[in-house]
């Protein structure tokens, strides 16, 4: 932005500048250019010997200027366009200035003036141009500063040229008020801080409803001596509830929200939220819908899931496999987990209690992501009720629970765990174990064995202990062996059928299971 302190051309000849010597040399004249009257100060004493004609401007108030720019538009006639070349003719003039705190009026003293420069034309007006009225206009600009007094004069010294000053414009430069990155920068006088620092650093202020981002730099710009803004640093962002529209922050429209200061626009309220008011920073959830603490505000509100589908409990001796399917209604979330709880009831007394401590789960039962689990170490002749609860990220925000139950009665002991202890060419030594809690119920163990491939005959041995040696067996032969507990109520669960092989007659002491 240029702040004009003096504009001769704009004054339409109304500026009465001082000429020295009075009535000689410089002369205010009017001409017609492009059918418009223009004014100029002119001098053309090219055949009268040495000249020293001065033209001084009126006193110019400096305002805030430190450096001023002087733009001159002028025309100079070619000395060769005059008859005989006009021996004393020149083609330059001199530009001067003087600072003062007061207007000296008509008191003109050359010694007060300091020369700025000799002004020479880039183009001179030759005879043909003059005749054709082609004004060869030259434009020269000079900078003066720093200025310190209240005002100043400019002066033009003619030394024998044929020159016309068509425009004298004096101005200083300001970086204009500016909006950049949602920051307002004030109009700033263009000054060099120093020769090594030609830029002035200016802090901006965020526009209404804009803020400096957390941990970010405040907005800064640099004002150059040419009155141009350079190198923006930092920025402002529209605060929560507001979005950037051109160079301003506008409140989010109803039905939209913005949760933080950012460059992003307002977002539409997500599903299952109530319509927001203007300038909303979030959208409230509909009744029955919730947001988990870690849910972004842009996410739809969700609700707890329904109970798992199709829970089944499949008894396998002293084990139960629980299987279920995902809830029909996930509540709009993917983070579903299941927890299994167990309750046992004694048939005789009808007493019930939790059984987490006495049973074993195939995996921890409180954050299951799979839809099945095996529960073992169940006691025989006990009624068990299993509850499978479906939970998601918002289940903790409500008191109600979504679960399905399945009950199972355990009538058998858990099958014994069987292993081969020793063997020879004619015998197999077999041992087994059952949970300690079930041992008191067992009366005897029944061991059934037969040759593999012989479906017609088998042998049975009963014992009260946890081992047996099977004798009179054929060498190098595979036998199928199963152990079953016998309780007062009848047979317990049988072990799985194991294959054990006797040693061959040439065989070694190595056991092969």
């Amino acid at each position: 932005k240029e702040v004009v302190l003096l504009d001769f051309a704009a004054m339409k000849g109304e500026l009465g500048w001082l000429t020295h010597p009075y009535g000689k040399g410089w002369d205010l004249m009017q001409n017609i250019m492009d059918d418009m009257p223009i004014y100029m100060y002119s001098v053309c004493n090219v055949v009268s010997g040495d000249q020293d004609n001065w033209l001084r401007t009126n006193w110019v108030y400096r305002e805030e200027a430190e450096r001023i720019f002087i733009e001159l538009k002028f025309t100079v006639r070619d000395c060769n366009s005059f008859p005989g070349g006009a021996s004393s003719c020149k083609e330059t003039f001199n530009l001067y200035y003087a600072e003062s705190d007061v207007d000296y009026g008509t008191n003109f003293q050359k010694r007060q003036f300091t020369k700025i420069d000799t002004i020479a034309p880039d183009e001179i007006t030759v005879s043909s141009d003059f005749e054709a009225r082609n004004v060869k206009l030259n434009v020269e600009e000079r900078m003066v500063g720093p200025l310190t007094r209240k005002g100043f004069y400019l002066a033009f010294q003619d030394i024998g040229a044929c020159v016309a000053l068509l425009s004298v414009r004096v101005y200083y430069k300001k970086c204009p008020e500016m909006l950049q990155s949602l920051a307002r920068f004030p109009e700033t006088i263009a000054v060099a801080v120093s020769d090594t620092q030609p830029l002035a650093t200016v802090a901006g202020t965020c526009v209404d409803h804009a803020v400096v981002p957390y941990g970010g730099e405040g907005p800064l710009m640099h004002c150059t001596v040419d009155g141009e803004w350079l190198v923006p640093i930092g920025q402002c962002l529209c605060q929560e509830g507001y979005e950037k529209v051109e160079d301003a922050c506008r409140a989010c429209s109803p039905g939209f929200f913005k949760s933080e200061a950012s460059e992003s626009p307002c977002l539409e309220c997500p599903e299952h939220t109530l319509p927001s008011t203007e300038g909303a920073t979030s959208c409230q959830c509909e009744e029955g819908y919730f947001r988990a603490p870690e849910d972004p505000l842009s996410m739809s509100c969700t609700r707890p899931p329904s109970a798992p589908n199709y829970l089944t409990a499949i008894g396998m001796g002293a084990k139960v496999e629980l299987r279920w399917t995902a809830p029909k209604d996930t509540g709009g979330r993917q983070d579903i987990v299941y927890s299994v709880t167990c309750e046992q009831c004694w048939p005789e007394s009808g007493e019930c209690g939790p059984c987490e401590a006495s049973v074993r789960y195939s995996e921890p039962p409180h954050a299951l992501t799979r839809t099945s689990v095996t529960v073992s170490d169940l006691e025989p002749h006990m009624n068990y009720t299993f509850a499978v609860e479906a939970r998601n990220g918002v289940s903790g925000l409500v008191t109600s629970r979504s679960f399905r139950t399945a009950s199972v009665s355990i009538n058998q002991t858990e099958p014994p765990k069987v292993r081969l202890e020793d063997r020879s060419t004619t015998s197999l030594s077999v041992t087994w174990s059952i949970p300690v809690s079930q041992q008191s119920r067992v009366w005897k163990y029944e061991v059934t064995y037969r040759k593999k491939g012989d479906a017609n005959s088998y042998n049975v041995r009963r014992t009260e202990g946890f081992s047996v040696t099977l004798d009179d067996l054929a060498p190098d032969t595979t036998y199928l062996v199963q152990v079953q507990a016998l309780t007062q109520e009848g047979q317990g669960a049988g072990s799985k059928v194991h294959e054990f092989q006797t040693l061959s007659t040439e065989g070694s002491a190595n056991m092969a299971v």
């Epitope: 002369d27 004249m29 009017q30 001409n31 017609i32 009257p37 100029m40 002119s42 001098v43 053309c44 004493n45 090219v46 055949v47 025309t75 100079v76 006639r77 366009s81 005059f82 008859p83 007006t125 005879s127 043909s128 003059f130 005749e131 054709a132 009225r133 004004v135 044929c162 020159v163 016309a164």
Partner: antibody
């Protein structure tokens, strides 16, 4: 010495035509703007027409526009004025005049010209 | 067109007198004004151009002044050779109009 010598004047009937000439010497003719100025008997001066150094532009007074034509032949150092549809009010002494910008000590040319050099004139009489 | 009005239309003066002739333009012509001298039966001669500039070879007793619409020609010490008719001419417009003339006669 600058010399301008007009010729071609005389008596002519209204509606008739006449061609005036102006022979130039003692200066570089092709540098000069040339003009015709007339003076009715006992009256003041009236500018008639002008022509630029190289043949253009040409300007005419409203009173002669469309009837008179100014021209020049720089190779012959001669200025012409072709006068057609002559009227009684065209009766006057016709002067050829010249202007050389070199002798005009101003920085910017005036909107028009004045006349530095004049011929002795030639009389044109339009009468029946 | 710009009208030029000279006054007086004639004047009588003696040798050595200071004589001033004025010329008024119907609109501003800045300083684009010339003065001519014409003697009976002769062609006009240029005296002054651009209101105040003396043409080459013209005696310094002739001077011109003025700008805008009011101009004057002054002869400061009339000489016998100066008895003639004087015309002003504006060249601010293409019409290049002349004043009606001022006749300076011997008293």
């Amino acid at each position: 010495e600058v010399q301008l010598l007009e010729s071609g004047g005389g008596l002519v009937q209204p509606g008739g035509s006449l061609r005036l000439s102006c022979a130039a010497s003692g200066f570089t003719f092709s540098h000069y703007m040339m003009a015709w100025v007339r003076q009715a008997p006992g009256k003041g001066l009236e500018w008639v027409s002008r022509i630029g150094p190289s043949g253009g532009p040409t300007h005419y007074a409203d009173s002669v526009k469309g009837r008179f034509t100014i021209s020049r032949d720089n190779s012959k150092n001669t200025l012409y004025l072709q006068m057609n549809s002559l009227r009684a009010e065209d009766t006057a002494v016709y002067y050829c005049a010249g202007y050389d910008s070199g002798y005009d000590y101003v920085a910017v040319a005036g909107p028009a010209e004045y006349f530095q050099h004049w011929g002795q004139g030639t009389l044109v009489t339009v009468s029946s | 067109d710009i009208q030029m009005t000279q006054s007086p239309s004639s004047l009588s003066a003696s040798v050595g007198d200071r004589v001033t002739i004025t010329c008024r333009a119907s609109q501003s012509i800045s300083t684009w004004l010339a003065w001519y001298q014409q003697k009976p039966g002769k062609a006009p001669k240029l005296l002054i151009y651009k209101a105040s500039n003396l043409h080459t070879g013209v005696p310094s007793r002739f001077s011109g002044s003025g700008s805008g619409t009011e101009f004057s020609l002054t002869i400061s010490g009339l000489q016998p050779d100066d008895f003639a008719t004087y015309y002003c001419q504006q060249y601010n417009a293409y019409s290049r109009t002349f004043g009606q003339g001022t006749k300076v006669e011997i008293k």
